[in-house]
Interface confidence: medium
Amino acid sequence: GITIPRNPGCPNSEDKNFPRTVMVNLNIHNRNTNTNPKRSSDYYNRSTSPWNLHRNEDPERYPSVIWEAKCRHLGCINADGNVDYHMNSVPIQQEILVLRREPPHCPNSFRLEKILVSVGCTCVTPIVHHVA
Amino acid sequence: GITIPRNPGCPNSEDKNFPRTVMVNLNIHNRNTNTNPKRSSDYYNRSTSPWNLHRNEDPERYPSVIWEAKCRHLGCINADGNVDYHMNSVPIQQEILVLRREPPHCPNSFRLEKILVSVGCTCVTPIVHHVA
């Protein structure tokens, strides 16, 4: 991998905590102003594999609100607006990092956590499993 | 909002840094063992709006590797396996949290950053935007 020289202006870290515990500035640098996925695009409605967005709230997590996609149908929408079960609507999932308050209810102490979220749905050709 | 009583066992925080700077334990609690999206599913190939996954690496960011989806076509794949430009392949995007080393090259000091990533693609009916 690339070896990057350590910046001499880095905060000190005690060996017993390092590198497991780090300092994190929560002043988020955010290039994206629109955080509500329902406003950012209407793909969830216009897709041939449409989905609903469900609000998942957890005050012990940062961010506390995450939107979860749930495919509306098993199949995909055809020209007539009907569900075609020859194709499958499937969720596109992504692992994301969140901060979990640890110990619980602490405002300034967290642990990194990876969670799997469904972001939207896509229409796929099904895999046929023939049973002998 | 819900008021949760503060845990008396929380680490101390100095007023000048609080609540902007917090302690984060990087020992990730991970319920998901498979982090390579190419292995986790083959939806990117089987979708009617297929996509390629591009590796985005940045040693100053945690996680340093993020996979970005790029739709293969403007249109969607039809029943004959051809690209149909009457429909549009569009990226499904999500805002995610990452940790950015700050100051740069510091192993134990970070700032939270929100970035927009494309997770996969979905097939949508197009909207007509006729320009006057």
């Epitope: - | 009457h86 429909m87 549009n88 197009p126 007509v128 006729h130």
Partner: antibody, heavy 120, light 112 residues
Framework: QVQLQQSGPDLVAPSQSLSITCTVS????????VHWVRQPPGKGLEWLVV???????TYNSALKSRLSISKDNSKSQVFLKMNSLQTDDTAMYYC??????????????WGQGTTLTVSS | DIVMTQVPLSLPVSLGDQASISCRSS???????????LHWYLQKPGQSPKLLIY???NRFSGVPDRFRGSGSGTDFALKISRVEAEDLGVYFC?????????FGAGTKLEIK
């Protein structure tokens, strides 16, 4: 203001090649596709080819073997090449823009046309 | 290829009259996504064609409301409620549901 400006030769000998350039302004070739359509004198319109915003192409299969389309996004130019010209290729050749969000809908804006006469 | 048949090929009218042009396709123009890609263009003498109507009945920007498109499946029509001098020229119907895109032979609207 959307504009498509065409340039190309007036007279070409049989069996020779044709090259026409369509220079666009008021929109980006990375957002919109460009079609080519021709019209023989006193006759109807015939669709030739389209180049999409991502650079992919769709041809009229009847002419595909003789046609080639390409573009230079940075110069806002689309190029049409046609080989092995015959007298029945004599026509007005038009480039036309289609809406970027609605592929295959309609040709909204047209160039002024390039007159091609194939004659010895 | 889809054949587009226009009737009539020539349409003499008096200014202020209503004009009606028919266009029939050899196959349905309903795409598998539910849209019908039938458009109308007007080509005035010595000019390039201009888009009038897209997707059967939608007027393109700047097109007067005296132009009305209708139809479905394989049968379509363009009606001009009160013909004005600037409406004279050749009207083409066109389909972009199937490749290759095809045009009708044109209907010449002229003064009686």
């Amino acid at each position: 203001q959307v504009q498509l400006q065409q340039s190309g030769p007036d007279l070409v000998a049989p069996s020779q090649s044709l090259s026409i350039t369509c220079t666009v302004s008021g929109f980006s070739l990375t957002s919109n596709g460009v079609h080519w359509v021709r019209q023989p004198p006193g006759k109807g319109l015939e669709w030739l080819v389209v180049i999409w915003s991502d650079g992919s192409t769709t041809y009229n299969s009847a002419l595909k073997s003789r046609l080639s389309i390409s573009k230079d996004n940075s110069k806002s130019q689309v190029f049409l090449k046609m080989n092995s010209l015959q007298t029945d290729d004599t026509a007005m050749y038009y480039c036309a823009r289609h809406d970027g969000y609605s592929y295959y809908y309609a040709m909204e804006y047209w160039g002024q046309g390039t007159t091609l006469t194939v004659s010895s | 290829d889809i054949v587009m048949t226009q009737v009539p090929l020539s349409l003499p009218v008096s200014l202020g009259d209503q004009a009606s042009i028919s266009c029939r396709s050899s196959q349905s123009l309903v795409h598998s996504n539910g849209n019908t890609y039938l458009h109308w263009y007007l080509q005035k003498p010595g000019q390039s064609p201009k888009l009038l109507i897209y997707k059967v009945s939608n007027r393109f920007s700047g097109v007067p409301d005296r132009f009305r498109g209708s139809g479905s499946g394989t049968d379509f029509a363009l009606k001009i409620s009160r013909v004005e001098a600037e409406d004279l020229g050749v009207y083409f119907c066109s389909q972009s549901t199937h490749v290759p895109l095809t045009f009708g032979a044109g209907t010449k609207l002229e003064i009686k």
